[in-house]
Interface confidence: medium
């Protein structure tokens, strides 16, 4: 079996001019392509992998929501030579939240890593964005986490930072087929420079107060201090599945339309996030795809 092969990390790694073919090992009988797009209220980026796969032919599309961070995943496996170029890796430039200028800042600032490399997303070096409230949701928390896509024996990962709806989530995550989006939330401007070691204790839990020992000359204090030994109370996760994005038309004859970009174009969005789901920004492409090797 021969499959297309590429890796895209918020760049043009799977753009037409960089397409490779690879012969699969004996016993490997499916080609795979997986696309994962992450959308914050300040932009979106994607990861994609094509190559020799494992398992059965089929499709698996899913949408996920992690505290207002939206993720769209498409996985496609097929059993014909070079059949794994059916997902359209084109995206339109995202107009965040429909029109970001229509939303006044809510006073919170967060570090933003949207398609940045791990090196560019270290500490306080990423750009700072002003949070705003959209779609009747309050985005006053900052997030620091990672998105990981695994397919075709390849794992690609990128950092994610930005404004979210939760200020206290700790090591929360959502998963899809070969996909994970996880991280922690925090309260306060620019608090998300590094939440990798965030513990489960949050500002919502009163601190344990150590009282001075009672003085022997006084009567024992009647003040009682209650400490909770139960697990930290955190708001219920807003994680929920979303309608799956629709897949692209399989590529066909060369005489048809060309389409490609540095990030996957995914149709549909999160229910309840119409303002920023881009449901109208990722129209299904008219006409079959162009089977060409780009860059030549």
């Amino acid at each position: 079996l021969e499959c297309y092969s590429c890796v895209q990390k918020a760049d043009d790694g799977c753009s037409p001019n960089k397409m490779k073919t690879v012969k699969c090992a004996p016993g490997v009988d499916v080609c795979t392509e997986a696309v994962g797009a992450v959308e914050t209220i300040h932009g979106q980026f994607s990861l994609a992998v094509r190559g020799c796969g494992s398992g059965l032919p089929g499709k698996n599309d899913r949408g996920l929501d992690l505290h207002g961070l939206l993720a769209f995943i498409q996985l496609q496996q097929c059993a014909q030579d070079r059949c794994n170029a059916k997902l359209n890796l084109t995206s339109r430039a995202l107009d965040p939240a429909g029109n970001e200028s229509a939303y006044p800042p809510n006073g919170v600032e967060c570090y933003s890593c949207v398609g940045l490399s791990r090196e560019a997303c270290q500490g306080t070096s990423p750009p700072v964005v002003s949070c705003y409230n959209a779609s009747d949701h309050v985005y006053k928390g900052c997030f620091d986490g990672n998105v990981t896509l695994t397919a075709a024996n390849v794992t690609v990962s990128l950092p994610v930072r930005g404004c979210v709806q939760d200020e206290f989530c700790t090591r929360d995550g959502v998963t899809g087929p070969g996909f994970t989006l996880s991280g922690s939330c925090c309260q306060g401007s620019r608090c998300n420079s590094d939440l990798r070691n965030k513990t489960y204790f949050s500002p919502r839990i009163p601190p344990l107060v150590r009282l001075p020992p009672p003085e022997p000359t006084t009567v024992a204090s009647t003040t009682s201090v209650t400490t909770s030994t139960s697990a930290p109370v955190r708001p219920t996760s807003t994680t929920k599945p979303m309608p799956a994005p629709t897949s692209q038309t399989p590529r066909q004859g060369v005489e048809h339309e060309a389409s490609r970009d540095e990030e996957p174009r995914l149709t549909g969005g999160a229910a309840g996030h119409q303002d920023r789901s881009n449901s109208g920004q990722y129209p299904a492409k008219g006409g079959p795809q162009q089977p060409h090797n780009k860059g030549c």
């Epitope: 092969s5 760049d11 043009d12 753009s15 037409p16 001019n17 960089k18 397409m19 490779k20 073919t21 690879v22 070079r82 170029a85 084109t90 995206s91 339109r92 430039a93 590529r251 060369v254 005489e255 339309e257 060309a258 389409s259 490609r260 970009d261 540095e262 492409k285 008219g286 006409g287 795809q289 162009q290 089977p291 060409h292 090797n293 780009k294 860059g295 030549c296």
Partner: antibody, heavy 117, light 111 residues
């Protein structure tokens, strides 16, 4: 039918500037990567630059990097190539080409740029 | 000098089979990048002839075929016709140059 029509070529002195345009029709321009490819008189093809469908990614051949700028206006279905600090070796027919899923599947008829003193 | 190496000329008589080679390196064809072939008739713009190593766009006769092996690719034209007289270019992406590269072109003459 797909059509690509280049314009803007002409005679220019070394060090001068020129802006090429490519008017596209017959396909969804905003979904297509586009390229400029040139061909010096009597010579072979040389890729110059390409731009992603949204315009957010641009790439250049080393020979033109820092001097040429590719851009696009998807609302006008037009691709551009701004050429500055032109040299005699930039003399060529410049083709606008659409990139299909992988290859350059449609080409314009070309516009001649002549750089001479 | 072109990154992809083609013979400058090739010739054949009508009905013959002609093969044009395209030699690359580990940073382009050998890296697994797909190869395309373009035909440029005299005085016209290039036209896509073969894409994705061996695929023909609709409208291209099955007399034209492409193949790829290792760091090389080849274009075969069977049942040669006078209208096949043209320049033929191979192309592929190149890692080291971060862009598409073309062969120097092969001028095919039908005797």
């Amino acid at each position: 039918e797909v059509q690509l029509l280049e314009s803007g070529g002409g005679l220019v002195q070394p060090g001068g500037s020129l802006r090429l345009s490519c008017a596209a029709s017959g396909f969804t321009f905003s979904s297509a990567w586009m390229s400029w490819v040139r061909q010096a008189p009597g010579k072979g093809l040389e890729w110059v630059s390409y731009i992603s469908s949204s315009g957010s990614s641009t790439y250049y051949a080393d020979s033109v990097k820092g001097r040429f700028t590719i851009s696009r206006d998807n609302s006008k279905n037009t691709l551009y190539l701004q050429m500055n600090s032109l040299r005699a070796e930039d003399t060529a027919v410049y083709y606008c080409a659409r990139e299909g899923l992988w290859a350059f599947d449609w080409w314009g008829q070309g516009t001649l740029v002549t750089v001479t003193s | 000098q072109s990154v992809l190496t083609q013979p400058p000329s090739a010739s054949g008589t009508p009905g013959q089979r002609v093969t044009i080679s395209c030699s690359g390196s580990s940073s382009n064809i050998g890296a697994g990048y797909v190869v395309h072939w373009y035909q440029q008739l005299p005085g016209t713009a290039p036209k896509l002839l073969i894409y994705d190593n061996n695929q023909r766009p609709s409208g291209v006769p099955d007399r034209f075929s492409g193949s790829k092996s290792g760091t090389s690719a080849s274009l075969a034209i069977s049942g040669l016709r006078s209208e096949d007289e043209a320049d033929y270019y191979c192309a592929a992406y190149d890692d080291s140059l971060s862009g598409p590269v073309f062969g120097g072109g092969t001028k095919l003459t039908v005797l």
